[in-house]
Protein backbone atom coordinates (compact mmCIF):
# COMPACT_ATOMS: atom_id res chain seq x y z
CA UNK A 1 0.00 0.00 0.00
CA UNK A 2 1.21 3.48 -0.87
CA UNK A 3 0.86 5.85 2.12
CA UNK A 4 -1.37 8.86 1.50
CA UNK A 5 0.72 11.97 0.90
CA UNK A 6 -0.44 15.55 1.27
CA UNK A 7 -0.13 17.95 -1.69
CA UNK A 8 3.08 19.53 -0.38
CA UNK A 9 4.71 16.13 0.27
CA UNK A 10 3.69 14.95 -3.22
CA UNK A 11 5.24 18.07 -4.77
CA UNK A 12 8.43 17.75 -2.72
CA UNK A 13 8.89 14.06 -3.53
CA UNK A 14 9.27 14.88 -7.26
CA UNK A 15 12.43 16.87 -6.51
CA UNK A 16 15.69 15.59 -4.99
CA UNK A 17 16.33 16.02 -1.29
CA UNK A 18 16.93 19.63 -0.27
CA UNK A 19 14.81 20.95 -3.13
CA UNK A 20 11.10 21.63 -3.65
CA UNK A 21 8.94 21.95 -6.73
CA UNK A 22 8.20 25.50 -7.91
CA UNK A 23 4.55 26.25 -7.12
CA UNK A 24 3.89 27.85 -10.53
CA UNK A 25 6.11 25.63 -12.69
CA UNK A 26 6.35 21.94 -11.80
CA UNK A 27 9.33 21.43 -14.11
CA UNK A 28 11.53 23.58 -11.83
CA UNK A 29 13.09 22.34 -8.57
CA UNK A 30 14.19 25.16 -6.26
CA UNK A 31 16.69 24.81 -3.41
CA UNK A 32 15.08 24.95 0.01
CA UNK A 33 16.02 27.68 2.47
CA UNK A 34 18.46 26.90 5.30
CA UNK A 35 17.26 26.82 8.90
CA UNK A 36 17.15 30.35 10.30
CA UNK A 37 15.78 31.67 7.00
CA UNK A 38 12.44 31.62 5.15
CA UNK A 39 11.30 31.77 1.54
CA UNK A 40 10.99 35.31 0.24
CA UNK A 41 10.83 34.45 -3.48
CA UNK A 42 10.95 31.15 -5.37
CA UNK A 43 13.90 30.56 -7.68
CA UNK A 44 13.24 32.13 -11.13
CA UNK A 45 14.51 29.09 -13.06
CA UNK A 46 16.50 25.83 -12.92
CA UNK A 47 19.91 26.24 -11.27
CA UNK A 48 19.05 29.74 -10.07
CA UNK A 49 19.06 30.78 -6.42
CA UNK A 50 16.00 30.76 -4.20
CA UNK A 51 15.58 34.12 -2.45
CA UNK A 52 15.78 33.29 1.26
CA UNK A 53 15.76 35.91 4.00
CA UNK A 54 16.84 35.62 7.63
CA UNK A 55 14.10 35.31 10.24
CA UNK A 56 13.37 38.50 12.13
CA UNK A 57 13.78 38.79 15.89
CA UNK A 58 11.11 36.80 17.72
CA UNK A 59 10.83 34.19 14.98
CA UNK A 60 12.72 31.10 13.79
CA UNK A 61 12.89 28.11 11.45
CA UNK A 62 14.56 25.00 12.89
CA UNK A 63 15.07 23.04 9.66
CA UNK A 64 15.46 23.59 5.92
CA UNK A 65 12.15 24.79 4.57
CA UNK A 66 10.18 26.72 1.99
CA UNK A 67 7.94 28.51 4.45
CA UNK A 68 6.64 31.97 3.51
CA UNK A 69 6.97 33.11 7.12
CA UNK A 70 9.17 32.14 10.04
CA UNK A 71 7.51 30.58 13.07
CA UNK A 72 6.85 32.69 16.17
CA UNK A 73 9.09 31.93 19.14
CA UNK A 74 7.39 30.17 22.04
CA UNK A 75 7.09 31.96 25.37
CA UNK A 76 7.62 30.14 28.64
CA UNK A 77 4.44 30.08 30.71
CA UNK A 78 5.03 31.82 34.04
CA UNK A 79 1.60 30.79 35.34
CA UNK A 80 2.70 27.14 34.88
CA UNK A 81 5.96 27.76 36.78
CA UNK A 82 8.05 27.45 33.62
CA UNK A 83 11.47 29.11 33.26
CA UNK A 84 13.51 29.82 30.16
CA UNK A 85 16.36 27.35 29.70
CA UNK A 86 17.60 28.89 26.44
CA UNK A 87 16.27 31.84 24.49
CA UNK A 88 14.97 31.75 20.95
CA UNK A 89 17.44 32.17 18.08
CA UNK A 90 16.74 32.39 14.34
CA UNK A 91 17.25 28.62 14.02
CA UNK A 92 15.96 27.31 17.37
CA UNK A 93 12.80 27.84 19.39
CA UNK A 94 12.82 28.91 23.04
CA UNK A 95 13.49 25.99 25.39
CA UNK A 96 11.39 26.06 28.55
CA UNK A 97 11.83 23.94 31.64
CA UNK A 98 11.45 23.82 35.42
CA UNK A 99 13.57 24.99 38.33
CA UNK A 100 15.86 22.72 40.34
CA UNK A 101 13.99 20.16 42.47
CA UNK A 102 10.92 20.40 40.27
CA UNK A 103 9.49 18.09 37.62
CA UNK A 104 7.31 18.57 34.56
CA UNK A 105 3.75 17.28 34.50
CA UNK A 106 2.34 17.19 30.99
CA UNK A 107 -1.36 18.05 30.89
CA UNK A 108 -1.26 17.54 27.13
CA UNK A 109 1.35 16.94 24.44
CA UNK A 110 2.54 20.56 24.39
CA UNK A 111 1.52 21.87 27.81
CA UNK A 112 3.43 21.16 31.00
CA UNK A 113 3.33 22.54 34.52
CA UNK A 114 6.19 22.57 37.02
CA UNK A 115 5.64 21.02 40.45
CA UNK A 116 7.96 20.56 43.43
CA UNK A 117 9.45 17.09 43.77
CA UNK A 118 8.04 15.17 46.75
CA UNK A 119 10.43 14.92 49.71
CA UNK A 120 8.99 11.62 51.02
CA UNK A 121 8.54 12.87 54.59
CA UNK A 122 7.56 9.89 56.80
CA UNK A 123 8.87 7.59 54.08
CA UNK A 124 11.87 6.84 51.89
CA UNK A 125 12.73 7.70 48.29
CA UNK A 126 12.06 4.65 46.12
CA UNK A 127 12.80 6.42 42.82
CA UNK A 128 14.43 9.86 42.62
CA UNK A 129 12.65 12.80 41.04
CA UNK A 130 13.28 13.06 37.30
CA UNK A 131 12.68 15.69 34.64
CA UNK A 132 9.23 14.37 33.79
CA UNK A 133 8.35 12.31 36.86
CA UNK A 134 7.87 13.03 40.52
CA UNK A 135 9.77 11.17 43.25
CA UNK A 136 8.29 7.75 44.02
CA UNK A 137 7.96 7.34 47.77
CA UNK A 138 7.65 4.27 50.00
CA UNK A 139 5.97 5.06 53.32
CA UNK A 140 7.12 4.00 56.78
CA UNK A 141 4.94 1.69 58.86
CA UNK A 142 1.91 3.55 60.20
CA UNK A 143 1.70 5.73 57.08
CA UNK A 144 0.04 5.30 53.69
CA UNK A 145 0.61 6.98 50.31
CA UNK A 146 -1.99 9.56 49.29
CA UNK A 147 -1.33 11.84 46.34
CA UNK A 148 2.37 10.96 46.65
CA UNK A 149 2.59 12.04 50.29
CA UNK A 150 2.94 9.75 53.31
CA UNK A 151 -0.11 10.33 55.49
CA UNK A 152 -0.65 8.95 59.00
CA UNK A 153 -2.86 5.87 59.21
CA UNK A 154 -4.93 7.76 61.78
CA UNK A 155 -6.34 9.59 58.73
CA UNK A 156 -7.36 6.33 57.03
CA UNK A 157 -11.12 5.83 56.65
CA UNK A 158 -12.37 2.26 56.32
CA UNK A 159 -13.82 2.89 52.86
CA UNK A 160 -10.49 4.06 51.41
CA UNK A 161 -7.81 2.01 49.63
CA UNK A 162 -5.47 2.63 52.59
CA UNK A 163 -7.28 0.06 54.71
CA UNK A 164 -5.03 -2.73 53.35
CA UNK A 165 -1.86 -0.80 54.17
CA UNK A 166 -3.15 0.37 57.55
CA UNK A 167 -4.89 -2.88 58.53
CA UNK A 168 -3.08 -3.41 61.85
CA UNK A 169 -3.81 0.16 62.94
CA UNK A 170 -7.46 -0.10 61.90
CA UNK A 171 -7.80 -3.41 63.77
CA UNK A 172 -6.30 -1.73 66.86
CA UNK A 173 -8.73 1.18 66.61
CA UNK A 174 -11.61 -1.28 66.10
CA UNK A 175 -10.40 -3.32 69.08
CA UNK A 176 -10.26 -0.24 71.27
CA UNK A 177 -13.76 0.77 70.19
CA UNK A 178 -15.08 -2.73 70.89
CA UNK A 179 -13.47 -2.89 74.33
CA UNK A 180 -14.96 0.47 75.18
CA UNK A 181 -18.51 -0.72 74.52
CA UNK A 182 -18.51 -3.81 76.72
Amino acid sequence: LVPHLGDREKRDSVCPQGKYIHPQNNSICCTKCHKGTYLYNDCPGPGQDTDCRECESGSFTASENHLRHCLSCSKCRKEMGQVEISSCTVDRDTVCGCRKNQYRHYWSENLFQCFNCSLCLNGTVHLSCQEKQNTVCTCHAGFFLRENECVSCSNCKKSLECTKLCLPQIENVKGTEDSGTT
Epitope: K78, E79, Q113, F115, N116, N134, E147, N148
Partner: nanobody, 119 residues
Protein backbone atom coordinates in the same frame (compact mmCIF):
# COMPACT_ATOMS: atom_id res chain seq x y z
CA UNK B 1 -15.95 26.75 51.37
CA UNK B 2 -14.72 26.82 47.78
CA UNK B 3 -17.52 26.66 45.22
CA UNK B 4 -17.40 26.66 41.43
CA UNK B 5 -20.69 26.74 39.56
CA UNK B 6 -20.69 26.27 35.78
CA UNK B 7 -23.59 27.29 33.56
CA UNK B 8 -24.43 28.07 29.94
CA UNK B 9 -24.29 24.59 28.42
CA UNK B 10 -26.97 23.18 26.17
CA UNK B 11 -27.81 21.72 22.79
CA UNK B 12 -26.43 23.61 19.80
CA UNK B 13 -26.12 22.88 16.08
CA UNK B 14 -22.71 22.43 14.41
CA UNK B 15 -21.29 25.86 13.61
CA UNK B 16 -23.21 27.44 16.48
CA UNK B 17 -21.99 29.37 19.53
CA UNK B 18 -22.31 29.15 23.31
CA UNK B 19 -20.95 31.09 26.26
CA UNK B 20 -20.12 29.19 29.42
CA UNK B 21 -19.80 30.89 32.80
CA UNK B 22 -18.24 29.76 36.05
CA UNK B 23 -19.24 31.60 39.22
CA UNK B 24 -16.58 31.27 41.93
CA UNK B 25 -16.85 31.79 45.68
CA UNK B 26 -15.06 30.85 48.90
CA UNK B 27 -11.59 31.99 47.78
CA UNK B 28 -9.85 35.08 46.41
CA UNK B 29 -10.72 34.59 42.75
CA UNK B 30 -8.36 37.35 41.52
CA UNK B 31 -5.36 35.49 43.00
CA UNK B 32 -5.93 32.24 41.11
CA UNK B 33 -5.17 31.26 37.51
CA UNK B 34 -8.22 29.37 36.23
CA UNK B 35 -8.75 26.44 33.88
CA UNK B 36 -11.48 24.98 31.67
CA UNK B 37 -11.30 21.22 31.17
CA UNK B 38 -13.78 18.92 29.47
CA UNK B 39 -14.74 15.28 29.44
CA UNK B 40 -16.32 13.78 26.35
CA UNK B 41 -18.55 10.70 26.79
CA UNK B 42 -16.38 7.65 27.53
CA UNK B 43 -13.13 9.65 27.39
CA UNK B 44 -10.61 11.14 29.83
CA UNK B 45 -10.22 14.76 30.90
CA UNK B 46 -8.93 17.18 28.27
CA UNK B 47 -7.33 20.52 29.13
CA UNK B 48 -9.20 23.11 27.04
CA UNK B 49 -7.88 26.50 28.10
CA UNK B 50 -6.44 28.45 30.99
CA UNK B 51 -5.99 32.08 31.94
CA UNK B 52 -3.66 33.85 34.37
CA UNK B 53 -4.75 35.88 37.39
CA UNK B 54 -5.22 39.16 35.55
CA UNK B 55 -6.57 37.78 32.27
CA UNK B 56 -3.50 38.70 30.25
CA UNK B 57 -1.91 35.32 29.41
CA UNK B 58 -4.11 32.63 27.93
CA UNK B 59 -3.56 29.14 26.56
CA UNK B 60 -5.72 27.07 24.20
CA UNK B 61 -5.52 23.41 23.23
CA UNK B 62 -4.87 22.95 19.50
CA UNK B 63 -8.33 21.41 19.11
CA UNK B 64 -10.06 24.69 20.12
CA UNK B 65 -7.52 27.33 19.04
CA UNK B 66 -9.14 30.11 17.00
CA UNK B 67 -12.66 29.02 18.00
CA UNK B 68 -12.78 29.44 21.79
CA UNK B 69 -12.02 32.53 23.90
CA UNK B 70 -11.35 32.35 27.63
CA UNK B 71 -11.84 35.48 29.76
CA UNK B 72 -12.52 36.46 33.33
CA UNK B 73 -14.14 39.28 35.28
CA UNK B 74 -12.43 39.54 38.65
CA UNK B 75 -14.96 42.11 39.88
CA UNK B 76 -17.73 39.52 39.36
CA UNK B 77 -15.64 36.46 40.42
CA UNK B 78 -16.58 34.83 37.13
CA UNK B 79 -14.71 32.86 34.47
CA UNK B 80 -16.04 32.61 30.90
CA UNK B 81 -15.56 30.43 27.85
CA UNK B 82 -16.96 31.82 24.61
CA UNK B 83 -17.24 29.00 22.08
CA UNK B 84 -17.69 29.61 18.34
CA UNK B 85 -17.89 27.31 15.29
CA UNK B 86 -18.81 24.38 17.49
CA UNK B 87 -18.24 20.85 16.21
CA UNK B 88 -19.64 17.45 17.17
CA UNK B 89 -16.29 16.61 18.81
CA UNK B 90 -16.79 19.53 21.25
CA UNK B 91 -19.63 17.58 22.87
CA UNK B 92 -18.57 17.10 26.51
CA UNK B 93 -19.15 18.10 30.09
CA UNK B 94 -17.17 21.30 30.70
CA UNK B 95 -15.67 22.00 34.13
CA UNK B 96 -13.89 25.01 35.54
CA UNK B 97 -11.15 24.59 38.12
CA UNK B 98 -8.36 26.42 39.88
CA UNK B 99 -4.95 25.83 38.35
CA UNK B 100 -3.35 23.17 40.59
CA UNK B 101 -0.49 24.38 42.80
CA UNK B 102 0.93 21.51 44.82
CA UNK B 103 0.58 18.62 42.42
CA UNK B 104 -1.10 17.45 39.21
CA UNK B 105 -4.64 17.14 40.55
CA UNK B 106 -7.66 19.41 40.73
CA UNK B 107 -8.68 20.15 44.30
CA UNK B 108 -12.07 21.72 43.56
CA UNK B 109 -14.61 21.09 40.82
CA UNK B 110 -17.96 22.38 39.84
CA UNK B 111 -20.73 19.99 38.81
CA UNK B 112 -19.95 20.76 35.17
CA UNK B 113 -22.17 21.93 32.34
CA UNK B 114 -23.05 19.69 29.40
CA UNK B 115 -22.48 20.98 25.87
CA UNK B 116 -24.06 18.88 23.11
CA UNK B 117 -23.28 19.74 19.50
CA UNK B 118 -25.68 17.93 17.18
CA UNK B 119 -27.92 18.61 14.20
Amino acid sequence: EVQLLESGGGLVQPGGSLRLSCAASGFTFAHEPMVWVRQAPGKGLEWVSHIDRVGQDTYYADSVKGRFIISRDNSKNTLYLQMYSLRAEDTAVYYCAMLPKRGPRFGYWGQGTLVTVSS
